[in-house]
Interface confidence: low
Amino acid sequence: MSKGEELFTGVVPILVELDGDVNGHKFSVSGEGEGDATYGKLTLKFICTTGKLPVPWPTLVTTFSYGVQCFSRYPDHMKQHDFFKSAMPEGYVQERTIFFKDDGNYKTRAEVKFEGDTLVNRIELKGIDFKEDGNILGHKLEYNYNSHNVYIMADKQKNGIKVNFKIRHNIEDGSVQLADHYQQNTPIGDGPVLLPDNHYLSTQSALSKDPNEKRDHMVLLEFVTAAGITHGMDELYK
């Protein structure tokens, strides 16, 4: 068990703070909830603290919760491939470029680390080149979320990881908006981290609303499990 992994044996409170600017539309989001890495479970509620969110909530899911991939469930035989927990408590910087097909792009930078007993994900997001009447600024996405695989590989040069995946957002007319994600994670501290073999995270996300919440918000339930690396040969013959 890595030193960082010991911090995730129980339920951990989570705080998410985002400052965003998409085509000049500025906004802030606060989120809070908890994560349980034993089950790969995240429960979070996000509130747009500046009024109405200028982009659809589903376009921010990867920035919020795929930001705290330290809550992914890594099976026993894969624990030596869990970069995310091994970087804690000092944490990691997570940078992404997200290309929305035939539309604009988000660039994000986040610091994910422990502050006391709370896991904090602080994000800055800049979006450019979006069409004002496109699927994103035109709010044409359905309020739901598909399952995805998130592919992880080591980046030995930077003592971190590279991550690639493609999100499929459902559009109200029945078509799909693709969002290509290019992600890099580097540790904040200079302690040892686990550099993984290639594998993937399998994600299931459910979006809902709080009937008592008047502000623009999103409630998120998510399960994330690591996969893609088989047991070693010695395991097969036990």
Epitope: T49, E115, T118
Partner: nanobody, 126 residues
């Protein structure tokens, strides 16, 4: 702008307790963190305790750990500092401060805060 008004200061004997309150008004939705600082005569303004507005996670100066507790009531837009086992060296003017959103993690320096109250005097007699 965010306006901050402190209350609850006063004179107390060593070993006693006080509870300070800081009521925030204005654009409180833009607040990321709030903190308490104190300034004794002729000394720098020192960090005491801080709290994140959204999740309520807390952080403390070493001198406050185990004796002081910071908390918040979001519905009332108020932050509290419960001070127990007070010592004469705790005598100071106590200031409430608010920080706008930004990237500083667990802000503890005075220049990391954007809004300040007028302060409330705490005197601990021996």
């Amino acid at each position: 702008q965010v306006q901050l008004v402190e209350s609850g200061g006063g004179l107390v004997q060593a070993g006693g307790s006080l509870r300070l309150s800081c009521a925030a008004s204005g654009r409180t939705f833009s607040t990321a963190a709030m903190g308490w600082f104190r300034q004794a005569p002729g000394k720098e303004r020192d960090f005491v305790a801080g709290i994140y507005w959204a999740a309520g996670s807390t952080y403390y100066a070493d001198s406050a750990k185990g004796r002081f507790t910071i908390s918040r009531d979001n519905a009332k837009n108020t932050v509290y500092l419960q001070m127990d086992s007070l010592k004469p060296e705790d005598t100071a003017v106590y200031y409430c401060a608010a920080r706008r959103r930004g990237f500083t993690l667990a802000p503890t320096r005075a220049n990391e805060y954007d809004y300040w109250g007028q302060g409330t005097q705490v005197t601990v007699s021996s």
